[in-house]
Interface confidence: low
């Protein structure tokens, strides 16, 4: 492969915003490889060498008073300006999440399982995901992947609940997000649809069988009693 | 107090590759970058270009300055080269996987430098290029880099996928595997027993009950035909 030595220069002009644009901090940062060597910080007001490598730059740039004035003004001319230009599609961007709940492992009831609440495709990243069992919030046994950035202005997260599902229990994943006016909830019941239909089929069949059997026996024995000894009585007039 | 938002204009220049990048980052997402070859602004999401504009030529001048700065710094550092930091690679899907439902595989390449990487998608061991896309090199707070590669796909039980990553910090290409994990149905033993027994008992009950009903009705009919003695 290509084994030539590599040399990397990085520059980062950073704008940090607090409470909208009420407080703004501007940083002009220079890096050789990963090492920052000189920076202008609007909180300081001049260039400072971060390492010895940046001393000549700090001294030279600080000697240019007008350059310093330009950098001191950057919180307005650069930061607040760019915030204003991009605000409508960045700061105000809202994409609502899609929520899916499923068991991570296909375990029978009354076995340890992991219920997954998959929250996908939302923006911004600030989100709250809670688990409830029969209406009570579950705080223990909750594991999360944390916020995952998809790289396309959407996020996803998986929030798992370690539990032993019991028949009849209702698990609810509740999601709160800036794109939603009220929390989004998705339920999961501690019995699969196939299991439920099997139980219904079995019980239904059993009850139906018993009804038929009961009715048959009732009719049969009723008629049996009515004609026993072949002593029929005549009609009374 | 933690800041609410951060906008970063991030630039780099790498020698001897002579590769440069200019991009704007908002809270870790790319707003746009400048295509150095085409000298044009490339918006990360197409709709961004409807709200704002950026003169790409300005970025070229910045890159020229970064190049000049790099030459000064290279000399000033006594030609100290960069130390390769190999990437961490993760493959995930855009949303929960369902058979034959379109989805996207995401290959997330993280925590590496220098910003040069070769990424290939493999389906059943063979390279795939149809529909693939990627981001530029994205900055990190520790001044390493991140990158995303995407592969749209149709999940099936037959196909397996790999994201193959080459970087100077790796001794050999790194492959991250992904395949559809078909969930095996729950055993549902109790339900199966109840269902089988219930249906069996039910069926037997229905058959026997029907026989008794027929017999009972017949007896009743026969007795009525004989009449009183």
């Amino acid at each position: 492969g290509d084994t030539r030595p590599r040399f990397l220069e990085q520059v980062k002009h950073e704008c940090h915003f607090f409470n909208g644009t009420e407080r703004v901090r501007f940083l002009d940062r220079y890096f050789y490889h990963q090492e920052e060597y000189v920076r202008f910080d609007s909180d300081v007001g001049e260039y400072r060498a971060v390492t010895e490598l940046g001393r000549p730059d700090a001294e030279y740039w600080n000697s240019q008073k007008d350059l310093l004035e330009q950098k001191r003004a950057a919180v307005d001319t650069y930061c607040r300006h760019n915030y204003g230009v991009g605000e409508s599609f960045t700061v105000q961007r809202r994409v609502y999440p899609e929520v899916t709940v499923y068991p991570a492992k296909t375990q029978p009831l009354q076995h340890h399982n992991l219920l997954v609440c998959s929250v996908n495709g939302f923006y911004p990243g600030s989100i709250e995901v809670r688990w409830f069992r029969n209406g009570q919030e579950e705080k223990t046994g909750v594991v999360s992947t944390g916020l995952i950035q998809n790289g396309d202005w959407t996020f996803q997260t998986l929030v798992m609940l370690e539990t032993v599902p019991r028949s009849g229990e209702v698990y609810t994943c509740q999601v709160e997000h800036p794109s939603l006016t009220s929390p989004l909830t998705v339920e999961w019941r501690a019995r699969s649809e196939s299991a439920q239909s099997k139980m219904l089929s079995g019980v239904g069949g059993f009850v139906l069988g018993l009804l038929f059997l009961g009715a048959g026996l009732f009719i049969y024995f009723r008629n049996q009693k009515g004609h026993s000894g072949l002593q029929p009585t005549g009609f009374l007039s | 107090i933690k800041e609410e938002h951060v906008i970063i204009q991030a630039e780099f220049y790498l020698n001897p590759d002579q590769s440069g990048e200019f991009m704007f980052d908002f809270d870790g997402d790319e707003i746009f970058h400048v295509d150095m070859a085409k000298k044009e602004t490339v918006w990360r999401l197409e709709e961004f270009g409807r709200f704002a504009s950026f003169e790409a030529q300005g970025a070229l001048a910045n890159i020229a300055v970064d190049k000049a700065n790099l030459e000064i710094m290279t000399k000033r550092s006594n030609y100290t080269p960069i130390t390769n930091v190999p990437p961490e690679v993760t493959v995930l899907t855009n949303s929960p996987v369902e058979l034959r439902e379109p989805n996207v595989l995401i290959c997330f390449i993280d925590k590496f430098t220098p910003p040069v990487v070769n990424v290939t998608w493999l389906r059943n061991g063979k390279p795939v290029t149809t529909g693939v896309s990627e981001t530029v090199f994205l900055p990190r707070e520790d001044h390493l880099f991140r990158k995303f590669h995407y592969l749209p796909f149709l999940p099936s039980t037959e196909d397996v996928y790999d994201c193959r990553v080459e970087h100077w910090g790796l001794d050999e290409p790194l492959l991250k595997h992904w395949e559809f994990d078909a969930p095996s149905p729950l055993p549902e033993t109790t339900e199966n027993v109840v269902c089988a027994l219930g249906l069996t008992v039910g069926l037997v009950g229905i058959i026997i009950g029907t026989i008794f009903i027929i017999k009972g009705v017949r007896k009743s009919n026969a007795a009525e035909r004989r009449g009183p003695l």
């Epitope: 000549p56 030279y60 007008d66 350059l67 330009q70 001319t77 | 020698n15 504009s53 003169e55 030529q57 300005g58 070229l60 001048a61 910045n62 020229a64 300055v65 190049k67 000049a68 030459e71 000064i72 290279t74 000399k75």
Partner: antibody, heavy 118, light 108 residues
Framework: EVQLVESGGGLVQPGGSLRLSCAAS????????MSWVRQAPGKGLEWVSA????????YYADSVKGRFTISRDNSKNTLYLQMNSLRAEDTAVYYC???????????WGQGTLVTVSS | DIVLTQSPATLSLSPGERATLSCRAS???????LAWYQQKPGQAPRLLIY???SRATGVPARFSGSGSGTDFTLTISSLEPEDFAVYYC?????????FGQGTKVEIK
């Protein structure tokens, strides 16, 4: 004293060559990018060429591309402009200037006259 | 290439008057990369303003620069006798770097 002094100008025939020099003093020459700017008699300023501090990057105006070569010798604190295939329209005062890119040229030499005529 | 058009070509004013020089770009120029120069006959240009509005070292406060995008202005608040000269704007945002054709400020 911080200064730039150009030399090498003169009269040359069309198609001929000339090499201009610019001696720098009073500052760390290798830390600065340098430019050549020219001014035809009675006309405005025209940027000609620029070179990075190490000499690794060079830039040219379309009007001189392929004919002029900018170079520098940092050990001698000297900037050069090799001019080949000279034309009448290259007649001008040639200034060497310190800086380009992030900073506009902030220090200029006094200029040297190049006349291209038969 | 970015074409810079300066207006007016000549400005006739008296000492003490305010001078307003315009520089219009054919396409948007980053304000960080626009400079103004002063040139007197037989002399090399002198940097007055860089970054559209920052005064270079030793430049009197009567000189000020403003503007963004395609329209830039150099203002001399009160003309001194030594200010009568030719003024050039230059963009160093896009290669090739270009100059305006100049505005001559002459004594009325």
């Amino acid at each position: 004293e911080v200064q730039l002094v150009e030399s090498g100008g003169g009269l040359v025939q069309p198609g001929g060559s000339l090499r201009l020099s610019c001696a720098a003093s009073g500052f760390t020459f290798s830390s600065y990018a340098m430019s050549w700017v020219r001014q035809a008699p009675g006309k405005g300023l025209e940027w000609v060429s620029a070179i990075s501090g190490s000499g690794g990057s060079t830039y040219y105006a379309d009007s001189v591309k392929g004919r002029f070569t900018i170079s520098r010798d940092n050990s001698k604190n000297t900037l050069y402009l090799q001019m080949n295939s000279l034309r009448a329209e290259d007649t001008a005062v040639y200034y060497c200037a310190r800086g380009y890119g992030r900073y506009s040229p902030d220090l200029w030499g006094q200029g040297t006259l190049v006349t291209v005529s038969s | 290439d970015i074409v810079l058009t300066q207006s007016p070509a000549t400005l006739s004013l008296s000492p003490g008057e305010r001078a307003t020089l315009s520089c219009r770009a054919s396409q948007s120029v980053s304000s960080s990369y626009l400079a103004w120069y002063q040139q007197k006959p037989g002399q090399a240009p002198r940097l007055l303003i860089y970054g559209a509005s920052s005064r270079a070292t030793g430049v009197p406060a009567r000189f000020s620069g403003s503007g963004s995008g395609t329209d830039f202005t150099l203002t001399i608040s009160s003309l001194e006798p030594e200010d009568f000269a030719v003024y050039y704007c230059q963009q160093y945002s896009n290669l090739p770097f270009t100059f305006g054709q100049g505005t001559k400020v002459e004594i009325k």
